[in-house]
Amino acid sequence: SPQNPGCPNAEDKNFPRTVMVNLNIRNRNTNSKRASDYYNRSSSPWNLHRNEDPERYPSVIWEAKCRHLGCVDADGNVDYHMNSVPIQQEILVLRREPRHCTNSFRLEKMLVSVGCTCVTPIVRHVA
Amino acid sequence: SPQNPGCPNAEDKNFPRTVMVNLNIRNRNTNSKRASDYYNRSSSPWNLHRNEDPERYPSVIWEAKCRHLGCVDADGNVDYHMNSVPIQQEILVLRREPRHCTNSFRLEKMLVSVGCTCVTPIVRHVA
């Protein structure tokens, strides 16, 4: 429940459009012990590509690109009866406003690929 | 390349710690045509859970929870020789500062589960 029940939600229409943001990141329990080798061990493996933009915060975002069209079977062969597809997520980033060296930013939505999963093909019935 | 090559990067030590942010989101129309049924068609299917927090922006975040320990085979049975694992990503959210109804926020890192992938078990070589 909100700390201040009477406060407008930041997504409300009447909420101020410009706010102050402290960039000292608070690190909620981000458990980094998690296995980072899934990209290699997955039946839908992926490569990670560095997306860098100095006008954005964070300036570096890693994006996944599936290695195969199909999925890797138990023998290590690619099975094209299944499909490797990217799992995408909308994230928020801060984009520097275009005035020279300003400390003003605008929120921006970005669609990023986080990893890949193996799916069964879907056959749409054509009339 | 940056619009303002001489400007400090927002991740630099000498960058101001507090900035102004415009909440009018740029890029609202991120391609929502992306298949939303992967969670059901995947060999490592997942359910989506609503994580709501009015003190956070965005206040609603959807998180994935793998349905099975193992992965679903071609016959629809769960194969426990493979593992369904969550693909996690660190995202940035805005957390309202604790002063009453303030328009001040702080950046916060959050580890979210975006979907699941099927991985082969790995045995770390034990000395």
Epitope: N29, N31, K33, R34, A35 | W46, H49, E63, A64, K65, C66, R67, H68, L69, Y80, N83, S84, V85, P86, Q88, S113, C116, V119, P121, I122, V123, R124, V126
Partner: nanobody
């Protein structure tokens, strides 16, 4: 080679107790966390409890909380599952497994996941 062998299963009356053992070889509990799982006939395998020797942390499924307790004997490289107040619904084959990840906040099917090796299982039958 990483191996796990369960024992201690059997037939018990409702309200009774059993202690299952999971003897590990080819690794120590510093290398992997240990999970207990079970599979009832015609049902899916589900998590029961997790154990990590690094800090002695444990985790239990809601269905067994307060009735089951996990412990370890590092010298014997064995993990135990003490099951009290058993109910007919606890009837299943019980497996222990070496797992890569134990994370209570994780969005896996259970708090310990990414199984490295399963044991062969031991049958527990609770009669009413």
């Amino acid at each position: 080679e990483v191996q796990l062998v369960e024992s201690g299963g059997g037939l018990v009356q409702a309200g009774g107790s059993l202690r299952l053992s999971c003897a590990a070889s080819g690794f120590t509990f510093d290398d992997y966390d240990i999970g207990w799982f079970r599979q009832a006939p015609g049902k899916e395998r589900e998590g029961v409890s997790c154990f990590t020797s690094s800090d002695g942390r444990t985790f239990y499924a809601d269905s067994v909380k307060g009735r089951f307790t996990v412990s370890a004997d590092n010298a014997k490289n064995t993990v135990y599952l003490q099951m009290n107040s058993l109910e007919p619904e606890d009837t299943a084959v019980y497996f222990c497994a070496a797992v890569n990840t134990f994370d209570e906040s994780a969005y896996a099917a259970f708090a310990c996941y990414d199984v490295v090796r399963w044991g062969q299982g031991t049958q527990v039958t609770v009669s009413s």
